[in-house]
Interface confidence: low
Amino acid sequence: SAPGEDEECGRVRDFVAKLANNTHQHVFDDLRGSVSLSWVGDSTGVILVLTTFHVPLVIMTFGQSKLYRSEDYGKNFKDITDLINNTFIRTEFGMAIGPENSGKVVLTAEVSGGSRGGRIFRSSDFAKNFVQTDLPFHPLTQMMYSPQNSDYLLALSTENGLWVSKNFGGKWEEIHKTVCLAKWGRKGTIFFTANHNGSCSNDRGMLELERTTDYGKSFKTVASKIYSFGLGGKFLFASVMTGKGTLRAIHVSVDDGDTWNMAQLPPVGHEQFYSILAANDEMVFMHVDEPGDSGFGTIYVSDDRGTVYSKSLERHLYTTTGGETDFINVTSLRGVFTTSILAEDKSVQSVISFDQGGEWVPLRKPADSKCDATARDPEKCSLHIHAAYSIATGLNVPMLPLSEPNAVGLVLAHGSVGDAISVMRPDVYVSDDGGYTWIKALEGPHYYTILDSGGIIVAIEHSSRPINVIKFSTDEGQCWQTYTFTRDPIYFTGLASEPGARSMNISIWGFTESFLTSQWVSYTIDFKDILERNCEEKDYTIWLAHSTDPEDYEDGCILGYKEQFLRLRKSSVCQNGRDYVVTKQPSICLCSLEDFLCDFGYYRPENDSKCVEQPELKGHDLEFCLYGREEHLTTNGYRKIPGDKCQGGVNPVREVKDLKKKCTSNFLSPEKQNSKSNGSAGGSGGLNDIFEAQKIEWHE
C-alpha cells in the first residue's frame, strides 16, 4: 500500500495552523430532523440549506422548515426562513435549482389537504428574495427547467396533467391531460407519454408518445403502443409493444421522433427490461435483461445511428429487484467504464473497459497487495470495486466510485483484492491513470471528495462513533495527513463540496447530541492556505493516457487517437485554481480492426479481432430495417466505432443498397402490425421498469 504518514511522504508544513485559521463552524438553531443542501450557480459560493423537522400526527403531518443561505461556500449561514413566510417545505421535491448560472430556485411548499393547488416559492436572484406563488394544480414531481431557457418550467400534477410555465412559474397552463411521463428534449421540445384512457401504471405498452415544439399549442403523436421512452445524447428511445403484445422492442430516432428505426436488439418480455447505461451524441450502452429473475443481462454498444448493436459484455449484473447496476463511466479518462458481472458461481466480479466497451478485463490488483480469502490462488487475483450493488446489499460502503473530468486519471473507490467482491470491510483504492493501476490509499471505508481539480483529496472515516478528524492528500492519495477540525466530536452525516471539483472548500455536516438537545452543525474548511501558491508550468508534467507499452508506436491509441495531458506533478503543492482547464494534445492513430464494430449479421469470436458472419445468416442477403425501408447490405462485416477518429491503415469497405421496400418500425403505428425484425428472439414474463436511476440515462 501507499506510504501512510511516514517520513517518505512530502508533508505539507504547518498545515494545522493554516487549516485552523480557515475552519468555520456553524451551529443551526433548530431540531435535528433532516437536512438538504444545494449549491446555487457555479462558483457563486451560494449554498441553500433546508432543515425539516416533522411530526406525523394521526390526521396530518405537523412540520417545520428552516431555510439558511450562505454566500461564502458555507463558512457563514443566515436564517432566511422569513423569506418563505416560515412555510413547511416538501423535502421529497428538494430544492429545484435552475440550470447553469441562472440563479433560479424553486421550493415546493406543503399545503393543507383541502387546498385547490400547491404553492411554490421562487427566486431568480440566487435566493436573496423569494416570491410566493399559488399553483392551479398539485405537483406530482419537482419542477423541470428547460435546459435551454430557465424561464420555462414543466411539471406533472397529481391528476396526471402536464403543466407549463413560460415565466418562471408565475403563470401556469395545463397543456395536456393523462400524461404519464414528460421530459424536456432539445431546443425546447417536450416529449411525453399519454394515455387517453386516463391510466398510467397499468397501461404501459398502450401509451402514446407525443411531442410539442411550441410549448403545448400543437402536438404530434410520434409513436404508439409505447411502454416507455428515454432520451440520451442525440437519441430518442422508445420501448414499443410488438404485434404479439407480450414482447417489447427498442426503437430509436435521431430526429426527435419524425422517423424511427428498430434497434437490432433482442426483444424483451414483460418481466425483463432495457436500460440505457450511458449515451452521448455518438453511441449508446444498452443493457438487455435476461429472461427470468436472473439478476443479469447483456451490455450492447451501438453504432452511430443507435440501430446496429454489438455484444459488449455478457452476465452483466443488474438486479431485477432493486434495479442496481455497478456500471460507472470513469469520467476522468476517455473511454473507461467499470461494472460488475455475475459469475457462474454467483459471485460478483468487477471488470473494466478502457475502449468504450470493446473489451472488458479484470482490474489489476495493487502491486504489493495480498489476495483475500475469496481467492483460489493466493498469488493470482484482481481488484474488485464496490458500487451500487454493494451499497444496496448493505455492505459497509459509504460511497460510490468517484472521478471528475477535470481531475485527469484520478479514480477513488472502495474495494477488495481477491477473486470476487468481498463482504468484508472494504478499503479505499486510488488510481491515478484512469483505472489501469491502483494503490491501497486508506484502510477501511471512508467518505471522500476531490477538490481543486485533483490537487487535494479529502476523506473522512466512515464510523458509527462521533468523529472530529479529516484526512487529506495533496499527491493523489499516496500520502495522507490528518487534521482535528473540532475538539467536540460530531455524529457525521455528510461531506459536501461544490460540484465540479474546482472548489477549495469542504463542508463537514453532522449533529451534536447532548442530554436534552440535538442540533445540526457544519464545519467548512478552506484549503487555500495549504495550496498557497498558484501552479506554474514547472508544476506540470506530460502524461500519455492509456499508455501500456511506450515502445509501441500505437501506444495510447483508444478509439483512433491518443491524448497527451499536462498533469500536476505529485510533488507540487500548489493551486490549480477555479479557472483550471485540462490541457491535452490529441494525435490521430492508424486504423486497425479494433477501430471497427462488427456490422449487422456479424460477430467477433472470443479473443479474435476479426468479425465473422453469424452462422444463421450465412449465404443470405442481409436485409434489415432502416429509415423505414428494407435495406440490402453488402458488407465485409465492419463498421467504424462511434467516435473513432482513426485514419489510414486498415479500411474495410461497406456499402448499403436501398431495396425501396417498406418495412417501417411499424409497431409504432397501431394500424400496421407485421413488422420484420432481425433482432434475436428471446424473452418472457412481467414488468420492472423505472426510469432515471442514479446516473443511468434511462431504465425503462
Partner: antibody
C-alpha cells in the same frame, strides 16, 4: 415461478375483523399493481380492491369502502387486506391476484372467509 | 358504474365444436377487457387480456376480439378440458374493475 399464497381466512362473527395476507414470490413484487378478488359460494367473481406498486394509490368496490383496507409491504413481498365490520354477505373465497394489462395474470389458491354467528 | 352482461348464460356444445361467448359493456371500455376460465374448486385462469392478447401458455384455439362495448371470446374447437365457466372483466379506470356474471360451457 410466480406464486401467490393467501392466508388468514377463517370463521368470524358479524361485526368482527380479519386480516388476510398474500405472500408473493417469483416476480418483482414492488413493480406490480396487486388486487383482491372474491367469490361467494356458488356465485361469480367480484373485484374487491386494488393497490398500486408503491402503495400510494388504492381503490375499493363500493360495498367494502370504509370497512376494508388494502396495503402492502414491499420489503416482505406481502399484500394485505384488513377486513373490519364484517357482514354475512362478505362470506367468500378471497383471491389475491397480480395485475397485468387489463386483467389479473396470476391468482392465489384462495382463502375462505366465513362470516356467521 | 359499468355493468358487464354475458351471453348466453349457458352454452351446451360437443367437443370439437366452435364456441362463441359474448360480453357487452354498458358503456365503452376501449380494449380494456379480459377473459378468464374457471373450473370447479380452482382459481380463475387468465385467457385473454386487452381484448385480444392471449396470456402466456394459452392455446391458440382461444381468441378474443372486439373493442368499445362488444367483445367476443371464441374457442375454435372445444377440447374436453375447455368445459368450464368463462368470465369477462373490464377495467374502466385505473384500479377499478368489474366482472361479468359468467357463461357456463357444458357438454351437450
Amino acid at each position: 415461478e410466480v406464486q401467490l399464497l393467501e392466508s388468514g381466512g377463517g370463521l368470524v362473527q358479524p361485526g368482527g375483523s380479519l386480516r388476510l395476507s398474500c405472500e408473493a414470490s417469483g416476480f418483482t413484487f414492488r413493480s406490480y399493481v396487486m388486487s383482491w378478488v372474491r367469490q361467494a359460494p356458488g356465485k361469480g367473481l367480484e373485484w374487491v380492491s386494488t393497490i398500486s406498486g408503491g402503495g400510494g394509490n388504492t381503490n375499493y368496490t363500493d360495498s367494502v369502502k370504509g370497512r376494508f383496507t388494502i396495503s402492502r409491504d414491499n420489503s416482505k413481498n406481502t399484500l394485505y387486506l384488513q377486513m373490519n365490520s364484517l357482514r354475512a354477505e362478505d362470506t367468500a373465497v378471497y383471491y389475491c391476484a397480480k395485475n397485468w394489462g387489463s386483467g389479473f395474470d396470476y391468482w392465489g389458491q384462495g382463502t375462505l372467509v366465513t362470516v356467521s354467528s | 358504474e359499468i355493468v358487464l352482461t354475458q351471453s348466453p348464460a349457458t352454452l351446451s356444445l360437443s367437443p370439437g365444436e366452435r364456441a362463441t361467448l359474448s360480453c357487452r359493456a354498458s358503456q365503452s371500455v376501449s380494449s380494456y377487457l379480459a377473459w378468464y376460465q374457471q373450473k370447479p374448486g380452482q382459481a380463475p385462469r387468465l385467457l385473454i387480456y386487452d381484448a385480444s392478447n392471449r396470456a402466456t401458455g394459452i392455446p391458440a384455439r382461444f381468441s378474443g376480439s372486439g373493442s368499445g362495448t362488444d367483445f367476443t371470446l371464441t374457442i375454435s374447437s372445444l377440447e374436453p378440458e375447455d368445459f368450464a365457466v368463462y368470465y369477462c372483466q373490464q377495467r374502466s379506470n385505473w384500479l377499478i374493475f368489474t366482472f361479468g356474471p359468467g357463461t357456463k360451457v357444458d357438454i351437450k
